[in-house]
């Protein structure tokens, strides 16, 4: 015979399982029984804490029976069949249903052996991030929209971004009982430089495999920001043509170019192209300052260059000459 | 209350066979489990094997199998215990026993008064 | 074959306390054995008091009480009675049959 206390019969299940919200879920319990242990199981009962009676018995003479029987079913058990298996099906899982489950057999000679299980209702969350078009404010405003609707619980948003920033999240009750809708917003003080830069935000939801990433593509309108390239200081009567560049960073881009001169309209030697100005060469000294005004949507700003053409040797440096 | 009542004693020869029962009352006789035990004449007690009253499902000492058979009739709530092939060492006081429920635990609450069977040439 | 061994005899005063003990040949007794405890009086049927090691059958007096106690089960009645005066019967579950005790017989005096 074998020692006393090799083994007792176990009843075996998850801590806890987790269902979506209007779909069916199982919960899983078994009766573990060591090699030569003889036990005989007379009743399955599924009963929830905190309720008076029980929510599904299986008899072992007397079947099924169910305190909503559309809505509850034993998988495994069957009449004249050994009762192991009290894995219980609930269809149409409600936020309600969320809690505790005691599995219980009765066997015999062993005595009642339960085991307890939680139920978690979860609800996939749908997520969407989208972009706050901002201007120039000079103070924090959201910058980018992230939002997990009807999630259970509700789903983790976090941001992440090389630009710092500050988040802002709230919940709000969703379309289904029970859910929650949570809105995040990633604050900053809007600047050119954060334009078209990324950010993502991250949901994190007990219903994902792994963390959803959304990208949000940045956008800040701001006015012209100019300068004024191609000019190196060295230019000398004699040398070729040059081209002076109006290079403007705008959202959105320039609608226009416009150049001129502090002394009012451009003199001959200077053309523009756009962007461009042409400076065709001069045969004698020239100290101007041109000015380059470009405009947008939201404005407008220019940017001044003092151009001087000086008389000296051609041939050792860059700059304007006759051909 | 709950009472069982044993049939009266028996007096058997040598390789006869003995059918004793136990009659239930006071309780729902088929979600029971029934014991059978004996006592010979200056020995201990000795299980003999149980039945479970709903189904008829049961469990024999490995010493009596193929000898012994347990049945229940649940329209009289009486449970039967044949001990066939009887020999001297047979000779006991048989006892029906029902099993009850103690919070989670099962323990021998109820017994028969007892049954005398005899093996003698 | 499993042996259950209890002491032949034991004598308590009333209003004493005693543990009658049960032990087995196959090693310490535990939880699995489901030890059940039953009274025999003198001329009278039967009676289960404990059940799966230490619970007292319903109408059991509370000066009945079960237990592991080392390696044995135990059966201790604290404020004996005269009525008490009985044979007491160990039966040990081994995985597929149950063994009874020799049976211990208790004096009250």
């Known amino acids: 015979w074998p020692p006393p206390g090799t083994g007792d019969v176990v009843v075996q299940a998850p801590t806890q399982v987790p269902g979506f919200l209007g779909d069916s879920v199982t919960l899983p319990c078994y009766l573990q029984v060591p090699n030569m242990e003889v036990t005989h199981v007379s009743q399955l009962t599924w009963a929830r804490h905190g309720e008076s009676g029980s929510m599904a018995v299986f008899h072992q003479t007397q079947g099924p029976s169910y305190s909503e029987s559309k809505r509850l079913e034993f998988v495994a058990a069957r009449l004249g069949a050994e009762l192991r298996n009290a894995s219980l099906r609930m269809f149409g899982l409600r936020v309600e249903d969320e809690g505790n489950y005691t599995c219980l057999f009765v066997t015999f000679p062993q005595g009642s052996r339960s085991v307890d299980i939680w139920l978690r209702v979860l609800a996939k969350p749908q997520n969407t991030a989208e972009v706050q078009k901002v201007q120039l404010t000079g103070e924090p405003v959201p910058m980018a929209r992230c939002v997990s609707t009807g999630g259970r619980p509700p789903a983790q948003i976090t941001w992440h971004s090389d630009l710092g920033g500050m988040p802002n999240t709230s919940q709000v009750p969703g379309f289904l009982s029970g859910t929650v809708t949570v809105t995040s917003l990633w604050i900053l003080v809007p600047s050119s430089q954060v334009d078209g830069k990324n950010v993502t935000c991250k949901v994190e939801h007990e219903s994902f495999e792994k963390p959803q990433l959304l990208t949000v593509n940045l956008t800040v309108y701001y006015p012209p920001e100019v300068s004024i390239s191609g000019y190196d200081n060295n230019w000398y009567l004699g040398q070729n043509e040059a081209t002076l560049t109006c290079d403007a960073r705008s959202n959105p881009e320039p609608t226009g170019y416009n150049w001129s001169t502090t002394m009012g309209p451009l003199p001959p030697f200077a053309v523009a192209q756009g962007a461009q100005l042409l400076i065709r060469p001069v045969d004698k000294p020239i100290n101007t300052t041109l000015i380059c005004n470009v405009t947008n949507a939201l404005g407008a700003r220019q940017a001044e260059l003092t151009v001087q053409v000086k008389e000296g040797p051609p041939s050792e440096h860059s700059g304007i000459s006759r051909n | 209350q709950v009472q069982l009542v044993q049939s009266g004693a028996e007096v058997k020869k040598p390789g006869a066979s003995v059918k004793v029962s136990c009659k239930a009352s006071?309780?729902?006789?088929?979600?029971?489990?029934i014991s059978w035990v004996r006592q010979a004449p200056g020995q201990g007690l000795e299980w003999i094997a149980w039945i479970y009253a709903g189904t008829g499902d049961t469990n024999y000492n490995q010493k009596f199998t193929g000898r012994v058979t347990m049945t229940t009739d649940t329209s009289t709530s009486t449970a039967y215990m044949e001990l066939r092939s009887l020999r001297s060492d047979d000779t006991a006081v048989y006892y029906c026993?029902?099993?009850?429920?103690?919070?989670?635990?099962?323990?021998?609450?109820?017994w028969g008064q007892g049954t005398t069977v005899t093996v003698s040439s | 074959q499993a042996v259950v061994t209890q002491e032949p005899s034991l004598t308590v005063s009333p209003g004493g306390t005693v543990t009658l003990t049960c032990r087995s040949s196959t090693g310490a007794v535990t939880t699995s054995n489901i030890a059940n405890w039953v009274q025999q009086k003198p001329g009278q049927a039967f009676r289960g008091l404990i059940g799966g090691t230490n619970n007292r059958g319903p109408g059991v007096p509370a000066r009945f009480s079960g237990s592991l106690l080392g390696d044995k089960a135990a059966l201790t009645l604290s404020g004996a009675q005269p009525e008490d005066e009985a044979e007491y019967y160990c039966?040990?579950?081994?995985?597929?049959?149950?063994?009874f005790g020799g049976g211990t017989k208790l004096t009250v005096l």
């Open positions: 006071g309780y729902t006789f088929t979600s029971s489990y």
């Open positions: 026993a029902r099993h009850g429920l103690t919070g989670r635990h099962w323990y021998f609450a109820v």
């Open positions: 039966i040990l579950w081994y995985s597929n049959k149950f063994v």
